[in-house]
């Protein structure tokens, strides 16, 4: 069989849900000496990137600025060792967001509800969508899907206190586009004194793992660049549509 | 945003050489990744070749390489693609495209990376 080098890990910088018209950053992470990275869009080559000097970093960052529908999709990315190219990474979904509309979030029976409650969220957007979205923040990648004509539901079914936080949905365009997203609705449950404080509460940055950990190289870094490499592909669990 | 506009095509007998030049308006000239692309008649615009911001990385589309050269003078607002042993197939509407990208060793392979055109030169080569 031909001999490939490991596959790298593709990321998106902050978040991989990009505001129309505003820059996204793709992180290649590769290998030490790679002399070229190439990211892919939709199966076709998009960009090309060559380091320099290429043995002093072990990844890319590629921009795509003017964010738009064009530019969203599947990404995935591969890169060269003298002329030996890694496997494809696996694949990232690219969403550009604030397209056309604003949805309206709502929660039933209300925002403050007690804990082992039915809760349902509603989204609704009285443009032509059937797609809507709903997302916790801190948990961007944990999408919820649900299809409606102008309103979607989403049943939460009995909620814990794991479900505090602040949700907002998006109507969807197709898998890739997406719309404005709704105003926050902050849900709290409450539950016995001791579950209450105990619960963790939610992060409102972006997902921590929505970072670029691209390195530059020291003598020890060469030896162990392999290993964590290959270290990291397997540990690094993917999101998909 | 800036403007592109194309010189330098006409029609030439196979095996000769052109020259195409793109003018670059405004002064953020070397900020920009720069493209040439074709379109024959009755087929989809495709990629020749490409050159970063200050000029470290170049690529070209394998039917070209070796044969057509890109290079830019970012003093001059100009990126040139130098065409040599021009064969028929070679005929086409040829486009400069730009683009703002932050690294200085990128470049946009995809129609979709490019978000400024110029309007083209027309290119014929005959036999």
């Known amino acids: 069989p031909k001999q490939t080098l490991p596959k790298p890990i593709i990321r998106a910088e902050s978040t991989y849900m990009v505001p129309k018209e505003k820059q996204a950053t793709l992180c290649c992470q590769g290998s030490y000496g790679a002399v070229e990275y190439q990211l892919h869009f939709e199966g076709s080559l998009f960009a090309v990137e060559r380091p320099k000097p290429p043995e002093r970093i072990n990844g890319v960052k590629f921009h795509i600025p003017d964010m738009n529908s064009r530019k969203a999709g599947r990404y995935s990315c591969i890169y060269r060792v003298g002329e030996l190219w890694s496997e494809r990474s696996d694949l990232l979904d690219l969403v550009v967001t604030e397209m056309y509309d604003t949805p309206t979030l709502s929660v039933h029976p209300g925002p403050e509800v007690t804990s082992g409650e039915k809760v349902t969220f509603y989204c609704r957007l009285d443009t032509a969508t059937s797609m809507f979205l709903l997302l916790k923040e801190g948990r961007s990648r944990d999408v919820q899907r649900s299809y409606g004509k102008v309103q979607a539901e989403f049943p939460m079914g009995p909620v814990t206190t794991a479900h505090r936080g602040s949700y907002r949905c998006f109507g969807s365009y197709n898998n890739y586009a997406w719309s404005f997203p709704s105003e926050p609705v902050k849900l709290l449950v409450t539950g016995d004194i001791e579950n209450t404080s105990l619960a963790p509460t939610d992060p409102t940055f972006p997902d921590s793992w929505d970072t670029c950990l691209l390195t530059r190289e020291t003598g020890l870094q060469k030896d162990l660049a392999l290993w964590d490499h290959t270290a990291q592909n397997h540990h690094h669990h993917h999101h998909h549509h | 945003q800036v403007q592109l506009v194309e010189s330098g095509g006409g029609l030439v007998q196979a095996g000769d050489s052109l020259r195409l030049s793109c003018v670059a308006s405004?002064?953020?000239?070397?900020?920009?990744?720069m493209g040439w692309f074709r379109q024959a008649p009755g087929k989809e615009r495709e990629f020749v070749a490409a050159i970063s911001r200050n000029a470290d990385t170049t690529y070209y589309a394998d039917s070209v390489k070796g044969r057509f050269t890109i290079s830019r003078d970012n003093a001059k607002n100009t990126v040139y693609l130098q065409m040599n042993s021009l064969k028929p197939e070679d005929t086409a509407v040829y486009y400069c495209a730009a683009d703002r990208y932050s690294s200085n060793t990128q470049v946009g392979v995809a129609r979709t990376y490019y978000d400024y055109w110029g309007q083209g030169t027309q290119v014929t080569v005959s036999s």
């Open positions: 405004g002064r953020t000239f070397s900020t920009y990744a």
